[in-house]
Interface confidence: low
């Protein structure tokens, strides 16, 4: 629990916080778990312990191995352990997985990519940031503060992105670079003309008088969220609540529904003791979206009532 | 209650331009469309422009394409469509219309723009 994995690049700056953590104030001491020998504090050497932290300026492979950090206050003493890796410098583009951090998914909206670990150095700006690679140019790549914006991410954006900066400890410049996967999700989906799933076109809906019909406007305007999306109905062209008519009402509030990943509008017109003139409306269910508006037309025929006789 | 007011509409020769302006009122802010629809007496109404006001990016019908631009004021929720060149064919009723991921959309009264010599 109290372990933490760690790696870097020789001939770059490695730091590694200690797994347990305490106050500023207290004293951390830090051993070379194999031989139980303490790391020296003093900042002349290549490997030194400062507070909760322990620097490999630069590391080398013969660092690799476990080291423990015991966070000692007044009353108690916690032990953690950081588990270092140093790796040779690979000699071609490919970064190995056992190299990367976690990845990062982007999207149009939000394409942050941030350098892992930057936090634990003393580094200045510009950051510098490859992907597989390739050094990043063009304009819609940002370097800011810590992390990368990428404009306008498309999915051709999905890559390895390793940032580069420089650490300075006490006036000597070390390299350090990080890499993470950045994949890139579609958030927003996409939109599409309106389909009206019901009623069919020109339906003819039987309806008994003195009863109450129900009418349902069902469509459909594309995957995701949909932004600017609307079902109604209409009498005659007006719009319900312009038509003065308080026994035909629209159910307040429209249905999201999601019909194979597809999202989907309902609205429902009541109509409350059918009246002979309700037969000679035209019921227009409208949808509309960005792309435009699709109309379906019913109107509505007398039930014959059942003839019981033999 | 979420109430637009839009303005700038009137008449005005081929080739002219107009401003039309939508003030929002009655919501908290967060991700949201504004844009704008036109009905053109006897037509279906039909889709203008957009603009997402969380990133900015716009969308309009290819008829109004390279003519018309949208833009918002977010300070202000106030969104404007700026209509150059005009033909007689742009005459409408032009409706501002709001909508967020998770209601609306929400119309306003519109405002007529006229387009002939």
């Known amino acids: 629990k109290f372990s933490k994995q760690s790696w870097g690049l020789e001939n770059e700056a490695l730091i590694v916080r200690c797994p347990r953590q305490g106050k500023p104030s207290y004293t951390v001491d830090w051993y070379y778990s194999q031989t139980n020998k303490s790391i020296p504090t003093q900042e002349r050497n290549r490997v030194f312990a400062s507070g909760q932290l322990l620097k490999f300026l630069p590391a080398a492979v013969a660092d690799s191995g476990i080291y423990t950090c015991i966070v000692r206050s007044p009353t108690f003493n916690r032990t953690g352990y950081a588990n270092v890796t140093i790796y040779k410098k690979q000699s071609d583009c490919n970064v190995p997985d056992y190299l990367m951090y976690s990845t990062v998914s982007g999207s149009e909206k939000n394409s942050k990519i941030y350098c892992p670990t930057i936090d634990l150095y003393n580094w200045t700006a510009p950051l510098e940031w490859f992907k597989n690679c390739q050094a990043l140019q063009g304009s819609r790549y940002r370097a800011h503060k810590s992390f990368l914006v990428i404009d306008n991410v498309m999915t051709e954006d999905a890559g390895d992105y390793t940032c580069k900066f420089i650490h300075n400890e006490n006036g000597a410049n070390y390299s350090v670079t990080a890499t993470r996967s950045f994949t890139v999700k579609d958030e927003q989906g996409f939109s599409l003309f309106p389909v009206i799933g019901a009623p069919a076109q020109n339906e003819i809906k039987e309806v008994e008088i003195g009863k109450n019909a129900n009418l349902t406007c069902s469509a459909c305007f594309g995957k995701g969220t949909q932004f600017l999306a609307a079902v109604l109905w209409q009498l005659n062209g007006t719009k319900i609540t312009d038509f003065g008519e308080p026994r035909i009402q629209q159910e307040e509030g429209q249905n999201q529904s999601f019909s194979n990943g597809l999202a989907c509008l309902d609205m429902v017109l009541r109509i409350a003791d059918v009246k002979e003139e309700d037969l000679l409306l035209q019921y227009d269910c409208l949808a509309l979206n960005l792309h435009g508006l699709r109309r379906h037309t019913v109107r509505l025929s007398r039930k014959n009532p059942i003839d019981h006789h033999s | 209650e979420v109430q637009l007011v839009e303005s700038g509409g009137g008449l005005v020769q081929p080739g002219g331009s107009l401003r039309l302006s939508c003030a929002a009122s009655g919501f908290t802010l967060g991700d949201y469309v504004m844009g704008w629809f036109r009905q053109a007496p006897g037509k279906e109404r039909e889709f203008v422009a957009v603009?997402?006001?969380?990133?900015?990016?716009?969308y309009y019908a290819d008829s109004v394409k390279g003519r018309f631009t949208i833009s918002a004021d977010n300070s202000k929720n106030t969104a404007y469509l700026q209509m150059n060149s005009l033909k007689p064919e742009d005459t409408a009723v032009y409706y501002c219309?709001?909508?967020?991921?998770?209601?609306?959309?929400?119309w306003g009264q519109g405002t007529l723009v006229t387009v002939s010599s």
């Open positions: 219309v709001v909508s967020f991921s998770t209601r609306g959309p929400y």
């Open positions: 603009i997402y006001t969380s990133d900015g990016s716009t």
